[in-house]
């Protein structure tokens, strides 16, 4: 069920996930000058049952110069606080992936972890793309990719995103759309999003305390 490959590389773009399907693994990577403690886990694993998903294992880094005398321990989520509002799900907002069964939230940071996280995704995972600073998006479709199983092999769908330098002219006149906008897609392709019109991540996330569906606070 693990995806054979990483999500597609789009020039001048990065991808991110909103939540992680059960079975996803996160490498325990440490920043330069630090390493995993000898008995430490190689990875964290998203596991769960029908009602709750969480990350197994802890990532722990220690200074490469020491011999495990000072262990930096992963901050543990003691309690997940959910702040629910009475607002109805907006048609402009996707169903919150992390509130669906079988998905884990973003693991909390740990001391001296590497800046970039390396995930190993499973079939059904969706990631969203965004052009990096200094580039703008030209779309012909969704700026997202899903790992699918086809004829016994896994593959990632191709995100319809081209990132062009700010000063360059549009390759597809009239085709420019807001960046990283999870757009409408057939039900058969994913049940994680409601059908939407074009909209920006800014409105899609509804991320303030006042408008969010819930916020998880890692203790």
């Amino acid at each position: 069920e693990l995806c054979d490959d990483d999500p597609p590389e789009i020039p001048h773009a990065t991808f991110k996930a909103m939540a992680y399907k059960e079975g996803t693994m996160l490498n325990c990577e440490c920043k330069r000058g630090f390493r995993r403690i000898k008995s430490g886990s190689l990875y964290m694993l998203c596991t769960g049952n029908s009602s709750h998903s969480s990350w197994d294992n802890q990532c722990q880094c220690t200074s490469s110069a020491t011999r495990n005398t000072t262990k930096q321990v992963t901050p543990q989520p003691e309690e997940q606080k959910e702040r629910k509002t009475t607002e109805m799900q907006s048609p402009m907002q996707p169903v919150d992936q992390a509130s669906l069964p079988g998905h884990c939230r973003e693991p909390p940071p740990w001391e001296n972890e590497a800046t970039e996280r390396i995930y190993h995704f499973v079939v059904g995972q969706m990631v969203y793309y965004q052009c990096v600073q200094g580039y703008r998006a030209l779309h012909r479709g969704p700026a997202e990719s899903v790992c699918k199983m086809t004829h016994g092999k896994t593959r990632w769908t191709q995100p319809q995103l081209i990132c062009t330098g700010e000063m360059e002219t549009s390759q597809f006149p009239g085709e420019e759309k807001p960046q990283a906008s999870p757009e409408g897609r057939p039900e058969s392709e994913t049940s994680c999003l409601v059908t939407t019109t074009d909209f920006q991540i800014q409105t899609e996330m509804a991320a303030t305390m006042e408008t969010s569906i819930f916020t998880t606070e890692y203790q």
Partner: nanobody, 125 residues
């Protein structure tokens, strides 16, 4: 060009509240994790709180957990820090920071590539 501008600092009594804001521009705010750091007089800058790109997951320094709340409004390109039950040891300059393109959290200074100028918070006893 990326700009981060903090506001909302001031002089308050112990036990009071303050709400800091950080107005962001020059980048796609909704795509980045953000964080708050602070620097007390004569001390190094330290982590206070961080929030993921979606605005749904948060993490706090032990010293502020339960008293401070970080949030972000992706529609208004603004980061917030609600500070309740302030204590004298919360005094310092508070900075907002933008996480690097591929960083999940703005947890360490290494995770961040842009910083605001800071806003002074002074808590008197």
């Amino acid at each position: 060009q990326v700009q981060l501008q903090e506001s909302g600092g001031g002089l308050v009594q112990a036990g009071d509240s303050l709400r800091l804001s950080c107005a962001a521009s020059g980048f796609n705010f909704g795509w980045h994790a953000m964080g708050w750091f602070r620097q007390a007089p004569g001390k190094e800058r330290e982590f206070v709180a961080t929030i993921t790109w979606t605005g749904r997951d948060t993490y706090y320094a032990d010293s502020v957990r339960g008293r401070f709340t970080i949030s972000k409004d992706n529609a208004k390109d603004t980061l917030f820090l609600q500070m309740n039950s302030l204590r004298p040891d919360d005094t310092g300059v508070y900075y907002c920071a933008k996480a690097r393109e591929r960083a999940t959290w703005a947890y360490s200074e290494d995770d961040c590539d842009y910083w605001g100028q800071g806003t002074q918070v002074t808590v008197s006893s």
